[in-house]
């Protein structure tokens, strides 16, 4: 808390300009009118104030707007945004995408901070859903943003927003998140033809059920091994050797290198060795010929 002291004669600020960098903290407090600061916030970012001086300016704005800053001030916060706490930001009502962009620009290159997370949360909640323009903006600044959301939060993403998602935006998503996103992507891309559809849906396939993988196997998609390895194990297990061969096309040879890793390892254990041998890859660990295969999962479901 800065002491209240009278402004020295001749030092009262008439405008926000570079002369203020020479003011001590107490002089800034005493000589800068908060209302003047609020109307000339756009100038602050061009002036090399120290972090300590910015603390004083923030304090003045906090006194002027105890209930939270108006958007006209928020949009021009610049580096002062880095001084805001999540508690400060929770008082704001940010509705303009331009304001959001301006603040994310200030934070560009920084790690995702609690302040930014709070800002995004306030903005998205204010909009009611994560629309395409917002998602476009957020993933441009934070490619991992989508995967930082819980499955519950992802459920508010409308299918139309899925068009804004790039493959790299899903890199860190776990299966639970892809389970939510996949049906939305399927809906979003449903009117595309086979090969175009596969290009778009590919990065979401970690959430695809068995029946969709079976359908894809009939479309000559030539799925690469990296995508196959990200599929849900429970979705891959029921696929036949023939279906996996069709699904992977020329990439089927890559199974050999992955035979010790999930889901390939678990899938091999479910296939007849005879069927695996037809691939000519030397895959081992299938069910020996003459053995009876019992589907215990069906039995468990009935009991």
């Amino acid at each position: 808390e800065v002491e209240k002291t009278a402004c020295p004669s001749g030092k009262k600020a008439r405008e926000i300009d570079e002369s203020l960098i020479f003011y001590k903290k107490w002089e800034l407090e005493a000589c800068v009118d908060a209302a003047l600061l609020a109307t000339q916030m756009d100038r602050v970012n061009a002036i090399p104030f120290t972090y300590e001086q910015l603390d004083v300016l923030k304090h003045k704005l906090d006194e002027l707007y105890p209930q939270g800053y108006p958007e006209s001030v928020i949009q021009h916060l610049g580096y002062l945004f880095l001084k805001m706490s999540p508690e400060d930001i929770r008082k704001w009502n940010v509705t303009s995408l331009e304001t959001l962009k301006a603040l994310l620009e200030v934070n560009k290159g920084h790690e995702m901070s609690p302040q930014v997370a709070t800002l995004i949360d306030r903005f998205v909640k204010g909009r009611g859903q994560l629309d395409k323009d917002t998602l476009d903006t957020l993933t441009a600044f934070y490619p991992g943003y989508l995967c930082s959301l819980s499955p519950e939060e992802l459920s508010s993403v409308p299918p139309s927003s899925i068009w804004a998602v790039r493959p790299q935006d899903l890199d860190t998503c776990d299966p639970r998140q892809l389970d939510v996103l996949y049906p939305k992507a399927r809906l979003a891309f449903q009117n595309m033809n086979g090969s175009e559809y596969f290009v778009k849906i590919q990065s979401f396939l970690g959430g695809a059920p068995t029946e969709d993988l079976k359908a894809l196997s009939q479309q000559n998609v030539s799925m690469d091994l990296a995508t196959f390895m990200k599929l849900r194990t429970d979705a891959v297990l029921p696929l036949t050797v023939a279906e996996v061969q069709k699904l992977l096309g020329p990439h089927v040879e890559g199974l050999k290198a992955e035979e010790r890793h999930r889901p390939v390892r678990d899938w091999i254990l479910r296939q007849r060795q005879d069927d695996l041998d037809t691939l000519g890859l030397g895959l081992q660990g299938g069910i020996p010929n003459g053995y009876l295969v019992l589907d215990l999962s069906m039995q468990e479901a009935l009991s």
Partner: antibody, heavy 117, light 107 residues
């Protein structure tokens, strides 16, 4: 008077890790942003990372992003730099500095990190 | 990233000389510029920030000027203790970047 003392430097093999520490005294550490800056004969001075007074705002130079982690312990008046997956090009004298925003007003004496096989 | 270019890279001068070092930014940085002095085996020392704000304890023979892309550090009357390397640094945008340095040597 303000003092910053780095420690933890040394010779390390490529791919290994090292943790630098910076002990601060003579000022209210918890009120100040802090930075790590390194200096090499080839590239000169390079700003590596900074951390806000509370530790909530952090920035890394692209050259170290994903490998280095800056942190602070305000109760111990200490700043840290955890350096993983070290490369030959990380060889440098590492300085911790008090960060004013427009400038770095106090620097430590530096800690030499040599990455070599 | 903003590139900072200093000139000259070295300058030979005598005690009492007026020395001028320039620093050019690859894009406008308003007044977000600092100057440092470094002596061999020592850490850099802040002389000036905000293009012209002299730090306390720094002799008044040092002065800084400029705005936008072109900046100048002037030593009005060189003293024996001023022989060192001088660096400029921008803080207008992240990452902050330094000039390559100007070495002031004894003629």
């Amino acid at each position: 008077q303000v003092q910053l003392v780095e420690s933890g430097g040394g010779v390390v093999q490529p791919g290994r890790s090292l943790r630098l520490s910076c002990a601060a005294s003579g000022f209210t550490f918890s009120d100040h942003y802090m930075s790590w800056i390194r200096q090499t004969p080839g590239k000169g001075l390079e700003w590596v990372s900074y951390i806000s007074s509370s530790g909530s705002t952090i920035y890394y130079a692209d050259s170290v992003k994903g490998r280095f982690t800056i942190s602070r312990d305000n109760a111990k008046n200490s700043l840290y730099l955890q350096m993983n997956s070290l490369r030959a090009e990380d060889t440098a004298v590492y300085y911790c500095a008090r960060d004013l925003g427009p400038s770095f007003d106090y620097w430590g004496q530096g800690s030499l990190v040599t990455v070599s096989s | 990233d903003i590139q900072m270019t200093q000139s000259p890279s070295s300058v030979s001068a005598s005690v009492g000389d007026r020395v001028t070092i320039t620093c050019r930014a690859s894009q406008g940085i308003s007044s977000w510029l600092a100057w440092y002095q470094q002596k061999p085996g020592k850490a850099p020392k802040l002389l000036i920030d905000a293009a012209s704000r002299l730090q306390s304890g720094v002799p008044s023979r040092f002065s800084g000027s400029g705005s936008g892309t072109d900046f100048t550090l002037t030593i009005s009357s060189l003293q024996p203790e001023d022989f060192a390397t001088y660096y400029c640094q921008q803080a207008n945008s992240f990452p902050r970047t330094f000039g390559q340095g100007t070495k002031v040597e004894i003629k």
